[in-house]
């Protein structure tokens, strides 16, 4: 259940050059510095485990400080093929090519990778986010225009000796960051090819990747402050459950969201919060330093374990699901947004979940590991937790089988 076996090559436990290589914040995404082309052009790239294209701004856009200039790269190769990626809201489109890519604060390798040069977009780039492209780290099945377009990580593993595994430590600040603070602050770490033991405490617990498209997992039980939501576990995974660093919130299927909010409301009923707070529309504020964390419940998600009939649970605090927001009008207070929202595409374990944990995407062994993050925000009374094993029967029944259609929910 835990990763206590002898370490494999590439999992040496210390990746100093990659620690602290992410910046950003949960509301606008975490990004890593990458270089593209010859001579190298430096860009900040959003780390997104919920999509599979490496796509970068390649034309002027009001929200971009810089963009990939293919004509300046001697190693650029045009694939003479377009790509169009629509989202529920917005889209990007561009031209496919390949070029040499490296990650300065990553493994010391250069790979030839597919690149979508974004020439037109709507509701994709975020004003002030400081990233100019997206690194889709999921599997080829959801790549656009089709699964024949090899994702970056596949190219990296194929062309180098980097082990087929990466791990993410996303560090929520616990307080709002202004633009200059984001640029100066540490956002976390993306360890490519291994696991860094300094980034977590306790043991790593693994859940199987159900299917290699998104990083799909199975949730078998949900508790609010230890109280079971008592729903048919299929509801938790309707129509899928994924781990997605490109999404801010913990997003839950409609029925699950309603039950969870009802339970969180009941647990925190000593204060009367407006309906708009639970919708994510209204902020709630307290005098600086007086946020009553104790009135809000912890949330536990039980995930299918690696052993038959065995599960483990990950527990997040209100410090993860109440997202700090800076508003000039209420700057004397500490204000927060409720960062759990409703989804029509299944459960999305976004930054709200990931900021509590060190998350290992062990592609080689088709599993995802969770351990308590060394950088998670907590108080003196409670801490995020990863605990197990628990006996859970018929966990396979918790998975939902999606009628086969071509769908993509990148960056929702």
């Amino acid at each position: 259940e835990t990763d206590e076996e002898p370490e494999e090559p590439g999992r040496r436990g210390s990746f100093v050059e990659m620690v602290d290589n992410l910046r950003g914040k949960s509301g606008q995404g975490y990004y890593v510095e990458m270089t593209v082309g010859s001579p190298p052009q430096t860009l900040n790239i959003l780390v997104d485990t919920g999509s599979s294209n490496f796509a970068v701004g390649a034309a002027p856009h009001p929200f971009l400080h810089r963009y990939y200039q293919r004509q300046l790269s001697s190693t650029y190769r045009d694939l003479r093929k377009g790509v169009y990626v629509p989202y529920t809201q917005g889209k990007w489109e561009g031209e496919l090519g390949t070029d040499l890519v490296s990650i300065p604060h990553g493994p010391n390798v250069t790979v030839r990778a597919n690149i979508a040069a974004i020439t037109e977009s709507d509701k994709f780039f975020i004003n002030g986010s400081n990233w100019e492209g997206i690194l889709g780290l999921a599997y080829a099945e959801i790549a656009r225009p089709d699964d024949s377009l090899e994702p970056f990580f596949d190219s990296l593993v194929k062309q180098t000796h980097v082990p087929n595994l990466f791990s993410l430590q996303l560090c929520g600040a616990g307080f709002p960051l202004n633009q200059s603070e984001v640029l100066a602050s540490v956002g976390g770490s993306m360890i490519i090819g291994g696991i860094d033991h300094s980034l977590y405490t306790g043991s790593l617990w693994y859940t199987p990747i159900r299917r290699e498209w998104y990083y799909e997992v199975i949730i078998v039980r949900v508790e609010i402050n230890g109280q079971d939501l008592k729903m048919d576990c299929k509801e938790y995974n309707y129509d899928k459950s994924i781990v997605d660093s490109g999404t801010t919130n913990l997003r839950l299927p409609k029925k699950v969201f309603e039950a969870a909010v009802k339970s969180i409301k009941a647990a925190s009923s000593t204060e009367k919060f407006p309906d708009g707070f639970w919708l994510g529309e209204q902020l709630v504020c307290w005098q600086a330093g007086t946020t009553p964390w104790n009135i809000f419940p912890v949330i536990s998600l039980y995930l299918m374990g690696e052993v038959t009939n065995q599960s483990f649970r990950i527990t997040i605090l209100p410090q993860q699901y109440l997202r700090p927001v800076e508003d000039v009008a209420t700057s004397q207070d500490d204000c927060y947004k409720f960062a759990i929202s409703q989804s029509s595409t299944g459960t999305v374990m976004g930054a709200v979940i990931m900021e509590g944990f060190y998350v290992v995407f062990d592609r080689a062994r088709k599993r995802i590991g969770f351990a308590v993050s060394a950088c998670h925000v907590h108080d003196e009374f409670r801490t995020a937790a990863v605990e197990g094993p628990f006996v859970t029967l018929d966990m396979e029944d918790c998975g939902y089988n999606i009628p086969q259609t071509d769908e993509s929910t990148l960056m929702t």
């Epitope: 509301g27 004003n127 204060e271 009367k272 708009g276 902020l283 504020c285």
Partner: antibody, heavy 116, light 107 residues
Framework: EVQLQQSGAELVRPGTSVKLSCKAS?????SYWIHWVKQRPGQGLEW???????????KYNQKFKDKATLTVDTSSSTTYMHLSSLTSEDSAVYYC?????????WGQRTLVTVSA | DIVMTQSQKFMSTSVGDRVSVTCKAS??????VAWYQQKSGQSPKALIY???HRYSGVPDRFTGSGSGTDFTLTISNVQSEDLAEYFC?????????FGGGTKLEIK
Amino acid sequence: EVQLQQSGAELVRPGTSVKLSCKASGYTFTSYWIHWVKQRPGQGLEWIGMIDPSDSYTKYNQKFKDKATLTVDTSSSTTYMHLSSLTSEDSAVYYCARSGVAFPYWGQRTLVTVSA
Amino acid sequence: DIVMTQSQKFMSTSVGDRVSVTCKASQNVGTNVAWYQQKSGQSPKALIYSASHRYSGVPDRFTGSGSGTDFTLTISNVQSEDLAEYFCQQYNSYPYTFGGGTKLEIK
């Protein structure tokens, strides 16, 4: 500095429609909902509805659901309110406001006059 | 819908005085009430949120109080620039509703 810049006054014929705009600046546009409020002389303030610029989710006051349609264009940080089948009852001052805690920021007003 | 009632349509006061504007909600709204000031021909300006918290930059002569159904906006040491109409608003539940307004006249 947070600013909400509304479009200019409109004089429109009964039965027609009008589209008002509200351009936001000074903050991350997709992080806060935009509300629209109606004010008629002697009738106080009435909340029309709101839109989430991050995903265009809307919520309306039942009273205005067949009258107003809210849309958003994130590329220009602009929210729109389309008012249809105008009558003299729709003659009013309209405001956009940004959420936070309640409505900390308001646009400068748009006067709509419906007259034959 | 929650009805917000400001029973006094007009209030008269003098510079330097203290005046209290009241607002009653038709059901419990906790402390989810805001107060706005609107001067003639202008947009509303946010004064108070969460019943008693002043927005940044609002002079401390404006004080809000109350919870549940009864709320008060108090202006101590009234200034001539306080000549305006004052509205309460509940943002506890949808649809958001406003009081009918109280016009403050300076004698």
